[in-house]
């Protein structure tokens, strides 16, 4: 007996071939011997089966001795043994229809779990193997669970259902709702304008929700809400903003915030949260601001940074075109009685300059 696997909602062709390449009498029945379709003259006739309105046959192939039955919009309960009677012989085809669906919405927040459930006909014992867009393989039986979704799980999941050495493939599109980056750091000289951007890692037709940026300044004892906003159909509107600093926010996506001036008192870490309508939980992105200041006071040239810096970062003071350099893995460096000339303050990570500030030291007479 031939076994054919089908997908719920799909269309399947059950083949039946005759040796003579001409129109001949044929009909298809189910396991209860109820006629589904057949031929009368040149006409296709339908029987009393519940399948009849979804069953068809390809007339132009009859001349080739091919008397296939096509079943549209497959249902799990269409799983059965079908009998094709042609040229005084019977061909049996066992059809097994499977369905694979996500238990919840396929738009899930990062960190949430995904469960895929297999619908299968009674008596079948299928196995399921799913591959994520990132190449992660997960195996299971009736259910497949992914406990904590990551950004890279967004995309088309390909799941293969196997039964009786036959396979059928399902494709399920999963959208992980997250920001493109978990964390980002902006490095600025004191006084410069600061741009924070929070691009999303997904697109939705309608995007509605609300968000807030909480800020923990390095110098402050507690965090403070800098701005709250609403998102309606991808349009951003500010609800409330602090007076100091007076942030500005772009009206369109991606979410974009502007701090007019980078000042040491603003250096620190922020957490932007976005709650989407009809979704439980929030999207998060951490943002850090590092501010540099180079000053000369009397005989002391100082370079300082504020904000979250890694201990492996190097802060240096260097006289342009000269060898004179002072470097430290610290948040401040200084030179006493500096030589006249253009000094550079550099914040670097393994030789890569993250931030640079120049200060001119004039000769003292």
């Amino acid at each position: 007996k031939k076994v054919v696997l089908g997908k719920k909602g799909d269309t399947v062709e059950l083949t039946c071939n005759a040796s003579q390449k001409k129109n001949t009498q044929f009909h298809w029945k189910n396991s209860n011997q109820i006629k589904i379709l057949g031929i009368q003259g040149l006409f296709l006739t339908k029987g009393p089966s519940k399948l009849s309105d979804r069953a068809d046959s390809r007339k132009s192939l009859w001349d080739q001795g091919c008397f296939s039955m096509i079943i549209k919009n497959l249902k799990i309960e269409d799983s059965d043994t079908y009998i094709c009677e042609v040229e005084n012989k019977k061909e049996e085809v066992e059809l097994l229809v499977f369905g694979l669906t996500a238990n919840s919405d396929t738009h899930l927040l990062e960190g949430q779990s995904l469960t895929l459930t297999l619908e299968s006909p009674p008596g079948s014992s299928p196995s399921v193997k799913c591959r994520s867009p990132g190449g992660k393989n997960i195996q299971g039986g009736r259910t497949i669970s992914v406990p904590q979704l990551e950004r890279q799980d967004s995309g088309t999941w390909t799941c293969t259902v196997s039964q009786d050495q036959k396979t059928v493939e399902f494709k399920i599109d999963i959208v992980v709702l997250a920001f493109q980056k978990a964390s980002s750091t902006v490095y600025k000289k004191e006084g410069e304008q600061v741009e924070f951007s929070f691009p999303l890692a997904f697109t939705l037709e309608k995007l509605t929700g609300s968000g807030e940026l909480w800020w923990q300044a390095e110098r402050a004892s507690s965090s403070k809400s800098w701005i709250t906003f609403d998102l309606k159909n991808k349009e951003v509107s500010v609800k409330r903003v602090t007076q100091d600093p007076k942030l500005q926010m772009g009206k369109k996506l991606p979410l974009h915030l502007t701090l007019p001036q980078a000042l040491p008192q603003y250096a620190g870490s922020g957490n932007l949260t976005l709650a989407l309508e009809a979704k439980t939980g929030k999207l998060h992105q951490e943002v850090n601001l590092v501010v540099m200041r180079a000053t000369q006071f009397q005989e002391n040239l100082t370079c300082e940074v504020w904000g979250p810096t890694s201990p492996k970062l190097t802060l240096s003071l260097k006289l342009e075109n000269k060898g004179a350099t002072v470097s430290k893995q610290a948040k401040a460096v200084w030179v006493l009685n500096p030589e006249a000339g253009m000094w550079q303050c550099l914040l670097s990570d393994s030789g890569q300059v993250l931030l640079e500030s120049n200060i001119k030291v004039v000769p003292t007479w």
């Epitope: 269309t11 062709e13 040149l42 068809d56 007339k59 132009s60 096509i70």
Partner: antibody
Framework: QVQLQQWGAGLLKPSETLSLTCAVS????????WSWIRQPPGKGLEWIGE???????NCNPSLKSRVTISVDTSNNQFSLKLSSVTAADTAVYYC?????????WGQGTLVTVSS | DIQMTQSPSSVSASVGDRVTITCRAS??????LAWYQQKPGKAPELLIY???SLQSGVPSRFSGSGSGTDFTLTISSLQPEDFATYFC?????????FGGGTKVESK
């Protein structure tokens, strides 16, 4: 909703090979046949040929020697190649889904053969 | 090959008119016939299949009849959006063939 999106070169020189691809989305790919039909400017429709998901083809005998139809089931796509084109092959080429009748069509691609 | 002959090749009509187009098959094709509507610059659209079954979403003013060799497409009350070219197609045997088309234009 089933959609067929087709693409390919629109301007060819005589003796070149016409090449078109059609991508199917939003519906079943197996169980149906996938056809190519053409329509010369201001004229009627001519069936070129068809293929199913397992690669079984049927072609119009008038074009069979020049036609190659192939299928890429992993991407739900099928393609047409028509070799040694002449000005008589200038037409709008359509891809379509067929069981007995053509119920979904691509947008059409005008292919002009000119020296 | 099965020959499909459509008549007339064009018909002039007014909104509200009853329009009839015929298609003759040679040889007999039972009820393996479809009707399509095509507007300029667009792909054809299936109206009627199996000679008399109305395709989902098609207005009920369109109807099909006939069997064997002679078939008819009727538009009971012509609407402004019905001015187009109509084709018949046989699905009885390969090669699948179409009629030459009937253009319904405004009187």
């Amino acid at each position: 909703q089933v959609q067929l999106q087709q693409w390919g070169a629109g301007l060819l020189k005589p003796s070149e090979t016409l090449s078109l691809t059609c991508a199917v989305s939003g519906g079943s790919f197996s169980g149906y046949y996938w056809s190519w039909i053409r329509q010369p400017p201001g004229k009627g429709l001519e069936w070129i040929g068809e293929i199913n998901h397992s690669g079984s083809t049927n072609c119009n005998p008038s074009l069979k020697s020049r036609v190659t139809i192939s299928v890429d089931t992993s991407n739900n796509q099928f393609s047409l190649k028509l070799s040694s084109v002449t000005a008589a092959d200038t037409a709008v080429y359509y891809c379509a889904r067929v069981l007995n009748y053509f119920d979904y069509w691509g947008q059409g691609t005008l292919v002009t053969v000119s020296s | 090959d099965i020959q499909m002959t459509q008549s007339p090749s064009s018909v002039s009509a007014s909104v509200g008119d009853r329009v009839t187009i015929t298609c003759r098959a040679s040889p007999d094709i039972a009820n393996w016939l479809a009707w399509y509507q095509q507007k300029p610059g667009k792909a054809p659209e299936l109206l009627i299949y199996a000679a008399s079954s109305l395709q989902s979403g098609v207005p009920s003013r369109f109807s099909g009849s006939g069997s064997g060799t002679d078939f008819t497409l009727t538009i009971s009350s012509l609407q402004p959006e019905d001015f187009a070219t109509y084709f018949c197609q046989q699905a009885n045997s390969f090669p699948l063939t179409f009629g030459g088309g009937t253009k319904v234009e405004s009187k």
